[in-house]
Interface confidence: low
């Protein structure tokens, strides 16, 4: 039997097609302000957005087994819709200015328009034509199509104010709408022509859905829920009345979700997810910045990207032709990301978070999250405050800088410490990197009066200063041992600046426009870093052929940047302490003839077989 | 249904501290995405923000009163007070708080007080 | 900071006829970054209208917002008699939030 949902703010209800019903609320905890909805039969789950929570949900239809499926990146993720034959999400999120898809449970999420697009609002598929419809509500409103992976973009209806509700009926092959400018409800051919005006007399018809011979609308001022023959407008009958603000309506029943394409056998035969095309046609798709393998069926995850943080996000851009938008990872609890790194070989990524006082790692996709640093005192979590951090990747170790204690740590990356290796009375360690290469760590030292760049072995040996003058708040360290080049910002001088690995060939890089610079990172040949004032990263060209660049702006609370370079397995077997850390118990240290000598933190002293530490 | 009431002294001289209390009830700033913001109204004139605090304790203050402000919260007591140091004359206004809920608009305000900067 | 410039800065309608304010940004401050909010004397400021174009509850489907990139408009379709007031626009696109200088409608 068919029957009509609604989402009413923290409400999602059903109600029967015919009048004087009473409206049943579906039994869902921690609803804030449900906005899009749309359900799958075969499943008999419903999907909903909530622009308040900037979530996505679902649920099935007795309000069981309720799970957020997206739960980061979005902003006003107001038009939203099942494909039902490839088990597929689309979202149009009128904040980010995207429209995406993810599988029903939200994995494998990739962008499929993100250029060019104005507020993007209400969206329909058409599953087995291959086809998606949006309205835009931006300076230009407009209805527009899509291939359903992002391509074949065409604008269909220029001509119409803030369009919404946007149905298909799917037997008459006519397209209908709400005008939010005007108040009608219009319709038109699945290309925009030959257009109708159903309703011309409504006060504010804001949701809208078909089914069979009637079309179903929410009005805003009548504050109902009113339905009319689909084609001419007459026949009108209220619902309900007395509904404030329902945001969106349908028809749950199967005849609004039939039809076969390719997708709906085996997924396509894809690895990740399965996007239909016209003319019933489909192609594989991928997560955002995976690449489709040769066989046209299955992705491979990136190798080269950028990383960047903000407050409460990690996120991930990639270089390409496509200028690919850059993506929100799924990692949970972030309170206040302070610095992040990167292991390439487990592609686990590491962060610092100074909300909590704790060095934590996890994968790409959030899972196997793990409390590498946390303080030994649970109930003093300032005993101590990580600032910065730097992987060994051939030793497997984390160097960490430390606010509450002023030393230089070091800890396995399974969390075991190693201990400390740099102290001092007037010690002020910040800003750490590690070049395990050439066996050197380098280091800000925030003094007072007296700022400097030191280098020492990564034992905290053969300590020297590089830079004591021209330095004011050196907050950022960055290293390329491929360049042999040492980067380093200071906030308060508001200059980048580079030297030779020695301390040789100081020069200024830039020093023009730059307020609050927090991070950089090498990637290929140019340098990238953040400035947490302009809200903004950039990067300079260091062959001095392309200058500087802005990369993206308008991003708040920026805190760290690191590029992630393809790691060669085989030059990273070659390394001396690859392989069983070099034999060493504590500290493996590469010497310049290119052998290894073990080493030990501060308080252990290395044993007479060379490789062991102990006790002094 | 959500409510917030400002309250501090009516008269201020000048160099002297101003400290206002907004009390609110309806909701909770230990609820994600949340917020209270300060902003005020010189008789006959515009609005002017001063400063929000949200949930999470992130705080930002207008820039030409910024060394001038502080803004903190007691989520207990469902308070948050402001603290505007060297009044002068040209301060005087009426000082509202308002409830935000992200995006930064404020959607819940208080009466307002009149604080009047005279020696 | 962004300056937000409102005009004109006093209209002068009878009820029934159709108002229309103008808020310029001195920047690009997006398509869902402004709000609208009406104050009448005595009174503290409410909020008509967020992210450019959505109403806030409660409000009259007689207002609407629109607007994109630097030029926003709020839009009274008829003048009721409780809409003479003084209107303000706030950008929230970039810190510090800013308010316009206010446009007051007043009745002819």
């Known amino acids: 039997e068919a029957f009509l949902l609604f989402s009413r703010r923290a409400d999602i209800r059903r109600i029967s097609l015919e009048t004087n019903n009473n409206n049943v609320a579906i039994p869902l905890t921690g609803v804030k302000e449900a906005s899009a909805l749309d359900f799958d039969v075969t499943d008999n789950r419903i999907y909903w957005t909530d622009i308040s929570l900037k979530t996505i949900s679902r649920a099935f239809m007795n309000g069981s087994a309720l799970e957020h499926v997206v739960e980061f990146g979005l902003d006003y993720p107001e038009g939203m819709a099942v494909d039902w034959l490839g088990k597929n999400l689309y979202w149009a999120d009128t904040g980010t200015n995207r429209i995406e898809v993810s599988k029903l449970d939200g994995q494998h999420r990739q962008v499929l328009v993100w250029k060019d697009l104005d507020s993007p609002r209400a969206l329909a598929l058409d599953p087995a034509e291959g086809f998606m419809y949006w309205t835009e509500w931006g300076g230009k409103p407009k209805i527009d199509r899509a291939a359903m992976d992002g391509s074949e973009r065409t604008t269909l209806v220029p001509n119409v104010g803030r369009a919404n509700g946007l149905t298909i009926d799917y037997a008459k092959r006519r397209l209908y709408w709400t005008d939010l400018d005007t108040n009608l409800i219009e319709s038109s051919n699945m290309l925009g022509l030959n257009r109708e005006v159903i309703a011309d007399d409504l006060p504010h018809p804001f949701g809208l859905t078909q089914y069979q011979d009637y079309i179903y609308w929410t009005d805003w001022s009548r504050r109902s829920i009113e339905r009319a023959n689909k084609t001419s407008g007459q026949n009108r009958t209220i619902i309900q009345g007395h509904l404030d603000y329902v945001m969106d309506i349908l028809v749950f029943h199967s005849s609004r979700q039939s039809g076969w394409n390719e997708c709906a056998s085996s997924n396509g035969h894809c690895s990740h997810l399965c996007l239909a095309v016209p003319v019933g046609g489909f192609v594989c798709g991928c997560p955002a910045h995976y690449s489709l393998n040769a066989d046209n069926r299955t992705c491979s995850a990136p190798t080269t990207f950028l990383l960047f943080s903000q407050k409460s996000a990690i996120n991930r851009m990639v270089i390409d032709e496509q200028q690919s938008p850059d993506i929100i990872l799924p990692i949970h609890s972030l309170r206040n990301v302070r610095a992040i790194d990167y292991d390439p070989l487990d592609k686990q990524l590491y962060w610092i978070d100074s909300r909590q006082n704790m060095i934590r790692k996890a994968q790409e996709d959030g899972s196997q999250g793990f409390t590498v640093v946390v303080s030994s005192v649970p109930s003093q979590n300032l005993e101590i405050q990580p600032y910065d951090l730097s992987i060994d990747i051939y030793s497997r170790y984390i160097y960490w800088t430390c606010e509450a204690t002023n030393v230089i740590n070091v800890t396995r990356l399974d969390g075991r410490s190693v201990g400390v290796v740099l102290k001092g009375e007037q010690d002020r360690p910040r800003a750490v990197v590690v070049n395990p290469e050439k066996g050197y760590m380098y280091f800000t030292n925030l003094q007072e009066r007296s700022p400097k760049i030191e280098r020492a072995a990564l034992d905290g040996t053969e300590r020297e200063v590089l830079f004591f003058s021209g330095l004011s708040k050196p907050i950022a360290l960055a290293l390329d041992s491929r360049l042999g080049k040492l980067f380093w910002a200071d906030s308060d001088l508001r200059r980048i600046e580079s030297s030779d690995l020695s301390g040789a060939n100081r020069i200024v890089l830039e020093d023009s426009n730059i307020l609050q610079p927090v991070g950089l990172t090498v990637f290929e040949n140019w340098l990238y870093w953040i400035d947490k004032q302009q809200q903004m990263i950039e990067k300079i060209d260091m062959t001095g052929r392309e200058g500087r660049t802005k990369v993206q702006a308008r991003i708040a609370q920026l805190s760290d940047i690191h590029a992630v370079k393809e790691l060669n397995l085989q030059e990273y077997r070659q390394h001396p302490c690859a392989q069983d850390n070099g034999g060493c118990s504590h500290i493996c240290l590469v010497k310049g003839d290119g052998t290894t000598r073990c080493s030990c933190p501060m308080h252990l002293v290395l044993l007479q077989d060379e490789l062991s530490c102990g006790e002094p | 249904q959500v409510q917030l009431k400002e309250s501090g002294p009516a008269l201020v001289k000048p160099t002297q501290t101003l400290t206002l209390t907004c009390t609110f009830s309806?909701?909770?700033?230990?609820?994600?995405?949340?917020?209270v913001g300060w902003i005020r109204q010189p008789p006959g004139k515009a609005l002017e923000w001063l400063a929000w605090i949200d949930w999470d304790d992130d705080k930002s203050y207008s820039t030409s009163l910024k060394t001038r402000l502080t803004i903190s919260k007691d989520t207990s007591k469902n308070q948050v007070v402001l603290t505007m140091t060297n009044m002068d004359p040209v301060d005087t206004a009426t000082y509202y708080c308002?409830?935000?809920?992200?995006?930064?608009?404020?959607?819940?305000w208080g009466q307002g007080t009149l604080v009047t900067v005279s020696s | 900071d962004i300056v937000l410039t409102q005009s004109p800065a006093t209209l002068s309608l009878s009820p029934g006829e159709r108002a229309t304010l103008s808020c310029r940004a001195s920047q690009f401050i997006g398509s869902r970054y402004l709000a609208w909010y009406q104050q009448k004397p005595g009174q503290a400021p409410r909020l008509l209208i967020y992210?450019?174009?959505n109403r806030a509850t409660g409000v009259p489907a007689r207002f609407s917002g629109s607007g994109s990139g630097t030029d926003f408009t709020l839009t009274i379709s008829s003048l009721e008699p409780e809409d003479f007031a003084t209107y303000y626009c706030?950008?929230?696109?970039?810190?510090?939030?800013?308010f316009g200088q206010g446009t007051k409608v007043e009745i002819k």
């Open positions: 706030q950008q929230y696109y970039d810190y510090p939030q800013t």
């Open positions: 308002a409830r935000f809920h992200l995006p930064l608009v404020f959607d819940s």
């Open positions: 992210g450019a174009s």
């Open positions: 309806g909701f909770s700033l230990s609820n994600r995405g949340g917020g």
